[in-house]
């Protein structure tokens, strides 16, 4: 065998992000010469799950009839030929919104801002959560995180955006999590819609203020600006 | 040491169904899948299907896929094997066995330990 | 399915004998090729997986060799309590499945 087999690639239709008791569909693509499919979950010890391939032998399926917290979680696969397992494949996360109950989202000091100006978007849960996700409908990247410092549960979390240019205009939601797993969400808030109105030649932000612009606005994720003094919260990444 | 403990024989009328039960220790039952196969009269084996005891997931032969449910229970480390429809071919015996990866070397698995098996016999 | 044909049905040899028994594979099924004991009393024990790959506490006498669709299980020094039926099973695709089976008796 001349080097290692190479790994193959992982996805879920209709997508990674999945209510509970919808149906989803993980997805291992490798080469025509697999024998089998190893479908692998983080921390579990046994193979999660194994298939035959589906002709012509290139790929297999592994099918959730009914999202559960159960199924979340971190996913690799592997797959076999005659010579032997491939590289694992890069991760897939798979999460679950409608684990608790809806946070609401709401734009300060309005959801209709001129360009330039400053706004905030708060997200606020009934029940204290220690992360919360601001998502923006079409988003390439859409998760922002903003995580609680030493697990201090919080009711909200600020996203504040300064200066405000045309392309923060949008939809966005916002979801509520626990430490504990991020694999597993609240429902959704409700679409907030953020107009932007003013010139329509904003200048472009500085990537260290508020939009990384590397490589187009809708295509790096939407990052907050300043501190985030009331919420005990920290930016965080995954 | 591993064991794997089956239910006692079985006498069961034409159309109807059975469940044997295998009860495992000495391993961590969560670790490893459960596999099923039978043994008819005089006859070799044949595979009914496996189960993975820590997500409920399950394989089967294509000829037993309408007719057996695999299922587990990891607070008491027992596995099922439940046929329905029984006609008098289903009688024989059926073993549990331990699936799990032999070896250092990732790749390797086979099933490494069976139970004494459970004769069912279907007769009017 | 893959069909795996064994040979012999049954053989008789003396303690000490060397005993071959051959297991043939309908397509190839890359070593993936394991051999099991049962002894008359039902009881199934691992030999030998991945071809040629001792199960811990298998006394040495057993062995295994082959690839592609043709696989060899050899005991080099038959021994009484080696009386049982030897199957082999192949583990390359779902469903596995098993050979016929050899009955291995004492002269």
């Known amino acids: 065998q001349a080097g290692p087999l190479p790994k193959p690639t992982l996805w879920a239709e209709p997508g990674s992000v999945i209510s509970w008791g919808n149906s989803v569909t993980i997805w291992c693509q490798g080469t025509l010469e697999a024998r089998e499919y190893r479908l692998d979950k983080e921390e579990s010890p046994a193979p999660w799950d194994r298939q035959n391939p589906l002709e012509p032998k290139n790929k297999a399926r592994f099918s959730i009839p009914s999202m559960t917290e159960d199924y979340a979680g971190r996913y690799r696969c592997y797959y076999r030929s005659p010579v032997g397992w491939s590289q694992p494949s890069d991760p897939l996360e798979l999460v679950m919104t409608g684990a608790y109950s809806k946070p609401t989202l709401s734009a300060l000091p309005s959801p209709l801002v001129t360009s330039g100006k400053s706004v905030t978007l708060l997200c606020q849960s009934r029940s204290p959560m220690d992360t919360f996700l601001l998502i923006k409908e079409r988003a390439a990247h859409p998760l922002l995180h903003l995580r609680s410092e030493h697990g201090a549960q919080q009711h909200q979390a600020e996203f504040p955006m300064s200066p405000v240019t045309s392309v923060h205009g949008g939809t966005y939601r916002c979801f509520s999590s626990h430490g504990f797993s991020h694999y597993l969400l609240s429902h959704p808030s409700d679409p907030l819609e953020l107009i932007v109105s003013g010139s329509l030649e904003d200048p472009r932000p500085s990537p260290t203020r508020s939009v990384s612009t590397a490589a187009g606005p809708e295509d790096q994720p939407l990052m907050p600006t300043g501190s985030v003094p009331h919420s005990g919260l920290r930016r965080h990444w995954e | 040491q591993v064991q794997l403990v089956q239910s006692g024989a079985e006498v069961k009328k034409p159309g109807a169904s059975v469940k044997v039960s295998c009860k495992a220790s000495?391993?961590?039952?969560?670790?490893?899948?459960m596999h099923w196969v039978r043994q008819a009269p005089g006859q070799g084996l044949e595979w009914i299907g496996e189960?993975?005891?820590?997500?409920?997931?399950?394989n089967y032969n294509e000829k037993f896929k309408t007719r057996a449910t695999l299922t587990v229970d990891t607070s008491t480390s027992t596995a099922y094997m439940e046929l329905s429809s029984l006609r008098s071919e289903d009688t024989a015996v059926y073993y549990c066995?331990?699936?799990?990866?032999?070896?250092?070397?990732?790749?390797?698995?086979?099933?490494?330990?069976w139970g004494q098996g459970t004769l069912v016999t279907v007769s009017s | 399915d893959i069909v795996m044909t064994q040979s012999p049905s049954s053989l008789s040899a003396s303690v000490g004998d060397r005993v071959t028994i051959t297991c043939r594979a309908s397509?190839?099924?890359?070593?993936?090729l394991n051999w099991y004991q049962q002894k008359p009393g039902g009881a199934v024990k691992l030999l030998i997986y991945?071809?040629?790959r001792l199960h811990s506490g298998v006394p040495s006498r057993f062995s295994g060799s082959g690839s592609g669709t043709d696989y060899t299980f050899t005991i080099s020094s038959l021994q009484p309590e080696d009386i049982a039926t030897y199957f082999c099973?192949?583990?390359?695709?779902?469903?596995?499945?098993f050979g016929g089976g050899t009955k291995v008796e004492i002269k």
């Open positions: 066995a331990r699936w799990g990866q032999l070896g250092l070397r990732e790749g390797y698995y086979a099933v490494d330990y």
């Open positions: 000495g391993y961590t039952f969560t670790n490893y899948w």
């Open positions: 189960i993975n005891p820590s997500n409920g997931r399950t």
């Open positions: 397509q190839d099924i890359s070593n993936y």
């Open positions: 991945y071809t040629s």
């Open positions: 099973q192949q583990g390359n695709t779902l469903p596995p499945t």
